[in-house]
């Protein structure tokens, strides 16, 4: 089942997704798509990275974190009710069927009518799967498809739900995470 995140109309939504490069510079292509993760790739791609840069995006979608260190969390600017739905974060690890897929459900709430201090993000988040993997390969920079195949070993799964929006800063520790190397 998908992990749920919430945001209000007019605010920015934040969908966490992380991986740990096997070695500095061993970046892995990532795609974000609207809709559940299909067997391959991402459907309705909204943003994509290669082994170095963001190489495709649509308006209002960006990576605000340090994506070259594995923080590929998606920010959606100025959300509307139409942004509700499932989003797929896919870590495209080289090798047959090695990709890691994370489905995140975004629920958009109507904006509060009563005046209140503006909050940048207001959502309820649950811990997505935490995953650790083991890999192999030299420490030198290898990119653009030169990474070796990586054997994945799933370690743990869904944990307790976070309800306090003040814990948004802790999402680095609770986001969809894959560790390579």
């Amino acid at each position: 089942s998908e992990v749920e995140y919430r945001a209000e109309v007019g605010q920015n939504a934040y969908l966490p997704c992380f991986y740990t490069p096997a070695a500095p510079g061993n970046l892995v292509p990532v795609c974000w798509g609207k809709g559940a993760c299909p067997v391959f790739e991402c459907g309705n791609v909204v943003l994509r990275t290669d082994e170095r840069d963001v190489n495709y995006w649509t308006s209002r979608y960006w990576l605000n974190g340090d994506f070259r260190k594995g923080d590929v969390s998606l920010t959606i600017e100025n959300v509307t009710l139409a942004d509700s739905g499932i989003y797929c974060c896919r870590i495209q690890i080289p090798g047959i069927m090695n990709d890691e897929k994370f489905n995140l459900k975004l629920v958009i709430k109507p904006a509060k009518v009563t005046p209140a201090p503006t909050r940048q993000r207001d959502f309820t988040a649950a811990f997505p799967r935490m995953l650790t993997t083991r890999g192999h390969g030299p420490a030198e920079t290898q990119t653009l498809g030169s990474l070796p195949d990586i054997n994945l070993t799933q370690i743990s799964t869904l944990a307790n739900e976070l309800r306090d929006s003040r814990l948004a800063n802790d999402l680095r520790d609770s986001g969809a995470t894959i560790r390579i190397g």
């Epitope: 070259r68 920079t141 990119t143």
Partner: antibody
Framework: QVQLVQSGAEVKKPGASVKVSCKAS????????MDWVRQAPGQGLEWLGY????????SYNQKFKGRVTMTTDKSTSTAYMELRSLRSDDTAVYYC?????????????WGQGTTVTVSS | DIVMTQSPDSLPVSLGERATINCKAS??????VAWYQQKPGQPPKLLIY???NRYTGVPDRFSGSGSGTDFTLTISSLQAEDVAVYYC?????????FGQGTKLEIK
């Protein structure tokens, strides 16, 4: 010390091609990307693309796609940038520049530049 | 493509005074902005990367700040050798793009 030494100035006619070389020394050639940037006379900087010598992977600016090809010769630690179907507005100084993960793929060492003049 | 817009185009500053150059991205680029210095007849030199990281050997009078869409290069006390053209670059997406340049001169 790191050095990038480029080939000499070129004068070409419209429609012709030019191939600029960039010989690297002082670092492991395959550990870094090689970017190419150009600067028209009195103008700003324009990124053409990059090549990763480790495996030959490339990324080109769409503006030049189909006209530009970047290659490397690992045995001589040399990068090449070929631009075809030259036009007068391709007149510029062409730079090669090294980029790597440590500086978030910004360009920390640059060649001296190669002046390409396109004139009939 | 992401458009980088620098201001001002030209900046006269007295020696010893502070110089501030701004760069605005057409969309958020996180912290992925670099600053380069270019003197006539020379290739650019990297000063700052990832918005605020000073490159090796760059004097500490140069500093960078900002995130998202708005970025600033500050020279705390202008020296004669700082006269040059300064460019911002976004290194977030492909194609990488540069600002149009700011010419820093002595007032």
């Amino acid at each position: 010390q790191v050095q990038l030494v480029q080939s000499g100035a070129e004068v070409k006619k419209p429609g012709a091609s030019v191939k600029v070389s960039c010989k690297a020394s002082g670092y492991t050639f395959t550990d870094y990307y090689m970017d190419w940037v150009r600067q028209a006379p009195g103008q700003g900087l324009e990124w053409l693309g990059y090549i990763y010598p480790n495996n030959g992977g490339t990324s080109y600016n769409q503006k030049f796609k189909g006209r530009v090809t970047m290659t490397t010769d690992k045995s001589t630690s040399t990068a090449y940038m070929e631009l075809r179907s030259l036009r007068s507005d391709d007149t510029a100084v062409y730079y090669c520049a090294r980029s790597g993960y440590g500086n978030y793929y910004t360009m920390d060492y640059w060649g001296q530049g190669t002046t390409v003049t396109v004139s009939s | 493509d992401i458009v980088m817009t620098q201001s001002p185009d030209s900046l006269p500053v007295s020696l010893g005074e502070r110089a501030t150059i701004n760069c605005k991205a057409s969309q958020s680029v996180g912290n992925n902005v670099a600053w380069y210095q270019q003197k006539p007849g020379q290739p650019p030199k990297l000063l700052i990367y990832y918005a605020s990281n000073r490159y090796t050997g760059v004097p500490d009078r140069f500093s960078g700040s900002g995130s998202g869409t708005d970025f600033t290069l500050t020279i705390s006390s202008l020296q004669a050798e700082d006269v040059a053209v300064y460019y911002c670059q976004q290194h977030y997406s492909s194609p990488s793009t540069f600002g149009q340049g700011t010419k820093l001169e002595i007032k």
